[in-house]
Amino acid sequence: HNTTVFQGVAGQSLQVSCPYDSMKHWGRRKAWCRQLGEKGPCQRVVSTHNLWLLSFLRRWNGSTAITDDTLGGTLTITLRNLQPHDAGLYQCQSLHGSEADTLRKVLVEVLADPLDHRDAGDLWFPGESESFEDAHVEHSISRSLLEGEIPFPPTS
């Protein structure tokens, strides 16, 4: 599995999308879990509705929400009020029985809020047509981890 990197700004929302084949995973609930260490278990953060037909309903666990477009084949996770401790490796999972298939491995990176430590000369004013909020909400940048890159920095 390649790892996809999603970057978000501290204090803002980050939206992670995990595409999948809706035929292959038809009838299966989904989950979002956090990888504990490189070889450790994946700790469940939040899962979709217990009734698969209601998977479109957004479910929250703290500041993390999950919703599933079961026909379109896209699982969406929202991390609200992103904090530095949210950075790390996660997985989108498809559940069947006691088993879980990995849909996507995700590395969440948290960028410092540029407005928290800006110089006066670095101020950015959005154009008149866009509101300040719209310019920042659900901000995410994704890329695939390059070969040789490691999702867990070596510990000293």
Epitope: N2, P19, D21, S22, M23, K24, L71, G72, G73, D101
Partner: antibody, heavy 123, light 112 residues
Amino acid sequence: QVQLVQSGAEVKKPGSSVKVSCKASGYAFSLSWMNWVRQAPGQGLEWMGRIYPGDGDTNYAQKFRGRVTITADESTSTAYMELSSLRSEDTAVYYCARLLRNQPGESYAMDYWGQGTLVTVSS
Amino acid sequence: GVVMTQTPLSLSVTPGQPASISCRSSQSLIHSNGYTYLHWYLQKPGQSPQLLIYKVSNRRSGVPDRFSGSGSGTDFTLKISRVEAEDVGVYYCSQSTRVPYTFGQGTKLEIK
């Protein structure tokens, strides 16, 4: 544009193996099934199996189970089909064919095909 | 697996005349998501197969509107309203509702 380019023709001895490659370009390789379909001379199309490169999941037709192995290398966007214990009846053109992951508005059909690879099994 | 049966196996048609190919599946091709994954392919002489119609009646982009698909459940039909010389080849119906995917035996269309 989407392209599937297969490896060249092969002549093999009975009992040996053959590995055919299919290099994909122009789309998200990880998010589509890659199917392998074969066609014996003058015969119809026969589905052999498929792989979802995103997670390596495979399915095989019962007839080929145990003899065929389908793999994919995401780093090079290449799918492979290896058929072992070859016999003369395996002489055929082997095609790879893409099938987009199921989404509204998409076909969930094999919309792009490779040019085919002729495998001849002869002693 | 699902058995796909096509009729006729060969067809000889005068240019400008209509043609019809039938395809029957051994079990319903309606998936529990409501879609029917029945497709039609054309293999022209010396070429790889090409997708014509997907999910029963949807023409693939670039396919002339003289081709149309219909049917439901287990019975499906491909119609060519006015056959042209370039339509020669073997037509296959196929299903991707259930694994293993399966094809019909093929119908060879010739021009009179």
